[in-house]
């Protein structure tokens, strides 16, 4: 996950700023197709965080169709047998083995487009996807470690006198919580759910009279969110003394 964050920081920044985008694609423009096969002989593996409920398009190496013999997509999802989708150009045949998820399909017919689409992305789509293109010159690979991101639900409330609780519920990966101003905070609690999401809870207390409003800032790969709350008075306090 760490690698995914650093390798894709630019893309993640873009996705934060363009929340309206319904699909994600790492596919290359046709103009970028490599004529010289030696440039792409090495296997390429891409770590790719994709937000849940979006559409994702995964691409094969940029090999010209006339050079193709077979295209194979290998899909390895957690706790499931490996699924393969293949297309043989000579016979114009497609074949599937152990593929049960109807949301994972060819973008169109493989003779037109070798890309794979996930429509829409679900939390169960975490896994490894690899396109293998067999040509007379050898096999060309492109692999994707797909990390499905789930936006946490953020809540903030005052549990008791001048103690606030901020929760980032069911996020993937775990969100990070910070406070303005800094308070006297208990260790952050994390609750792991069976589907791979995590609930993070931070509880903090502010003793000083002069703290009026506290802000909980939740940082997450899908975007950041802040909530704030005006604290109740210090118990028993009627009038402020010279506080400042």
């Amino acid at each position: 996950e760490g690698a995914a964050q650093s390798n894709n920081s630019l893309m993640l920044q873009t996705s934060k700023e363009n929340h309206t985008l319904a699909s994600n694609s790492l596919c290359m423009d046709e103009k970028q197709i490599t004529q010289n096969h030696s440039k792409v002989l090495a296997e390429v593996n891409i770590s790719w965080p994709v937000q849940m409920a979006r559409n994702a398009v995964l691409c094969c190496p940029p090999i010209e169709f006339r050079n193709l013999i077979v295209i194979t997509w290998e899909i390895i999802l957690r706790g499931q047998p490996s699924c393969t989708k293949s297309y043989r150009k000579e016979t114009n045949e497609t074949k599937e083995t152990n593929c049960t998820d109807e949301r994972i399909t060819w973008v169109s017919t493989p003779d037109q487009n070798s890309d794979l689409q996930i429509h829409p992305v679900a939390i169960t789509h975490d896994g490894y996807y690899r396109c293998i293109m067999a040509t007379p010159d050898g096999n060309f690979h492109r692999g994707y470690h797909l990390q499905v991101l789930v936006t946490p639900e953020v809540t903030l409330f005052e549990s008791r006198n001048r103690t606030a609780v901020c929760k980032a519920v069911a996020g993937k990966p775990a969100a990070q919580i910070s406070w303005i101003p800094a308070g006297d905070c208990a260790p952050t609690e994390q609750e792991y759910w069976g589907n791979g999401t995590v609930t993070v809870k931070s509880t903090c207390h502010w003793e000083g009279h002069n703290v009026s409003t506290v802000t909980c800032h939740v940082s997450h790969l899908t975007g950041n969110k802040s909530l704030y709350i005006e604290l109740l008075p210090v118990p028993g306090a009627k009038k402020s003394a010279k506080l400042y």
Partner: antibody, heavy 114, light 107 residues
């Protein structure tokens, strides 16, 4: 939707006191801080203090300490701001607000003139 | 007290231009803030809450950014009805403190 209805304009002599009211509706009166802000003619906004009607807890800005009194009447969902020992520089529009500044009254013009 | 330094104090801009106003909190103390618009004879109107959240019904040409001690308010394409005075307000600490205001005039 929160609504804050303030009392009408006042004209006072220097040295007198003024009491401005602000009646709240549309939210749980005892659960939210109520704030007072003033604005002298052609000047910026100045926070005076706040009151928590649920407990009567108050904070006053140091500048007004000793001259300002904020109170709340929970039976009528009304807060009051009384400013004493008035001087000409207290001529201003006085606003009540709540919800960290999301809802404001229309303001009450207090003119201090001899 | 936290002092809020707002700049510029005034500016004259043409319709369609981009406008940027900044607010900085003193003492290096992280705070949260709102941005208000005030027209003559009216109460201030909240435009941006919590530094960057556009209030309901406020046109999308208004935006806010920043965190900690430095904040920016932007009007992407100035409209004639945007002529007003704009204020920031820090509401993290008592006493709450406003910026000095920025008077925005249309050229």
């Amino acid at each position: 939707e929160v609504q804050l209805v303030q009392s009408g304009a006042e004209v006072k002599k220097p040295g007198a006191s003024v009491k401005v009211s602000c009646k709240a509706s549309g939210h749980t009166f005892t659960s939210y801080w109520m704030h007072w802000v003033r604005q002298a003619p052609g000047q910026g906004l100045e926070w005076m203090g706040n009151i928590y009607p649920g407990s009567g807890s108050i904070n006053y800005d140091e500048k007004f300490q000793g001259r300002v009194t904020m109170t709340a009447d929970t039976s009528t969902s009304t807060v009051y701001m009384e400013l004493s020992s008035l001087r000409s520089e207290d001529t201003a529009v006085y606003y009540c607000l709540t919800g960290t500044g999301t809802s404001w009254g229309r303001g009450t013009l207090v003119t201090v003139s001899s | 007290d936290i002092q809020m330094t707002q700049s510029p104090s005034s500016l004259s801009v043409s319709v369609g231009d981009r406008v940027t106003i900044t607010c900085q909190a003193s003492q290096g103390t992280p705070i949260n803030l709102h941005w208000f618009q005030q027209k003559p004879g009216k109460a201030p109107k909240l435009l941006i809450s919590g530094a960057s959240n556009l209030e309901s019904g406020v046109p999308s040409r208004f935006s806010g950014s920043g965190s900690g001690t430095e904040f920016t308010f932007t009007i992407s394409s100035l409209q004639p009805e945007d002529a007003a005075t704009y204020y920031c307000l820090q509401f993290t600490y008592i006493p709450w403190t406003f910026g000095q205001g920025t008077k925005l005039e249309i050229k």
